[in-house]
């Protein structure tokens, strides 16, 4: 487990290091999961780089915020916001928020405790 | 069915200690986060403090911190809140509450809730 | 002062609907939970809804959560007398690594 550096990381601070790092990895990663690796997800050029690669690259990424729990939900609720409207119906937006839950512990950080990742506003 | 006793409460001098216990039955008690809610004289609820199944993590409200401390004994059913250092604001009933607080994508909410006991700090 | 911000006060005829809001912040209800509870005059508060929107078993589905943003509202349908009592919000704040409850909103049922 990384190092706790803050103990909940302040909302504003947390708000400046999710809009600086790049989640696309993340959503990729995520998104090759659900969809088994098929093809028919073109939204991404998802082909060019393996889900253990995109894997450590979203990782990476989120290594680059403050490692505390407040954070985390931030970048955790920004990607299902980003992935949403791609979401095509109730499964398989319930498919991604199980391997967005996965996610903290795959890259060995702590899971956001009470993150409410419904936060689309009905979208999702 | 799910019972939650608190006993303890009493008039006490600005400075003294209190320790509130509550009793619990009816459900697995080790399985489930616990809680204090306070409720001051005709004012609204306040959270106070909240206990980890285990024991192993605590939160405490700031004013409280440091006067406070919340404990459980898993194998008597029971919670308790040892208050030092007591002053006239935390004059209020003492509710003792089960928080429904599960994994990390759930909130705390508080499903089950005792009749209180009446803390008064005063000289 | 309650960080997180309900109406003191709302009134409404039987059988009617009303709404209570419930306005935070990014750090509380932006991010987490919300819960609703009812207190009636010299009782212990009561669980309305959990987790925004869930009811648990024996509330009638007469009352109703939602979240939007940093705002969470619970809603009330085919009012009774009985349900004159004080409403309170609550949810965790992660800033403060604390739960907060709103400053509760007193429903009159005229």
């Known amino acids: 487990m990384r190092r706790e550096r803050g103990r909940q990381g302040d909302s504003s601070s947390c708000e400046r290091q999710v809009d600086r790092v790049n989640l696309k990895p993340c959503e990729q990663h995520i998104m090759q999961r659900i969809m088994g690796e098929q093809e028919q997800y073109d939204s991404y050029d998802i082909r060019s780089t393996r889900s253990s690669d995109q894997q450590q690259r979203c990782c990476d990424e989120l290594n680059e915020m403050e490692n505390t729990q407040r954070c985390m939900c931030e970048a955790l609720q920004q990607i299902m916001e980003n992935q949403c409207d791609r979401l095509q119906d109730r499964q398989m937006v319930q498919q991604f928020k199980r391997e967005l839950m996965n996610l903290p512990q795959q890259c060995n950080f702590r899971a956001p405790q009470r993150c409410d990742l419904d936060v689309s506003g009905g979208r999702c | 069915e799910v019972q939650l006793v608190e006993s303890g409460g009493g008039l006490v001098q600005p400075g003294g200690s209190l320790r509130l216990s509550c009793a619990a039955s009816?459900?697995?008690?080790?399985?489930?986060?616990m809680t204090w809610v306070r409720q001051a004289p005709g004012k609204g609820l306040e959270w106070v403090a909240n206990?980890?199944?285990?024991?192993?993590?605590?939160d405490y409200l700031d004013s409280v911190r440091g006067r406070f401390t919340i404990s459980r004994d898993n194998a008597k059913n029971s919670l308790y809140l040892q208050m030092n250092s007591l002053r006239a604001e935390d004059t209020a009933v003492y509710y003792c509450?089960?928080?429904?607080?599960?994994?990390?994508?759930?909130?705390?909410?508080?499903?089950?809730w005792g009749q209180g006991t009446l803390v008064t700090v005063s000289s | 002062q309650s960080v997180l911000t309900q109406p003191p006060s709302i009134s409404a005829a039987p059988g009617q609907k009303v709404t209570i809001s419930c306005s935070g912040t990014?750090?509380?209800?932006?991010?987490?939970?919300v819960s609703w509870y009812q207190q009636l005059p010299r009782t212990a508060p009561r669980l309305l809804i959990f987790?925004?929107?869930k009811r648990p078993s024996g509330i009638p589905d007469r009352f109703s959560g939602s979240k939007s943003g940093s705002s969470a509202t619970l809603g009330i349908t085919g009012l009774q007398t009985g349900d004159e009592a004080h409403y309170f919000c609550?949810?965790?704040?992660?800033?403060?690594?604390?739960?907060?409850f709103g400053g509760g909103t007193k429903l009159t049922v005229l």
């Open positions: 990014g750090s509380n209800i932006g991010h987490n939970y």
């Open positions: 009816g459900f697995k008690f080790s399985t489930f986060y």
């Open positions: 206990i980890k199944q285990d024991g192993s993590e605590k």
């Open positions: 609550a949810t965790w704040d992660a800033d403060l690594s604390a739960v907060l």
């Open positions: 987790d925004n929107t």
């Open positions: 509450t089960r928080n429904g607080l599960q994994d990390s994508y759930s909130g705390d909410f508080f499903d089950h």
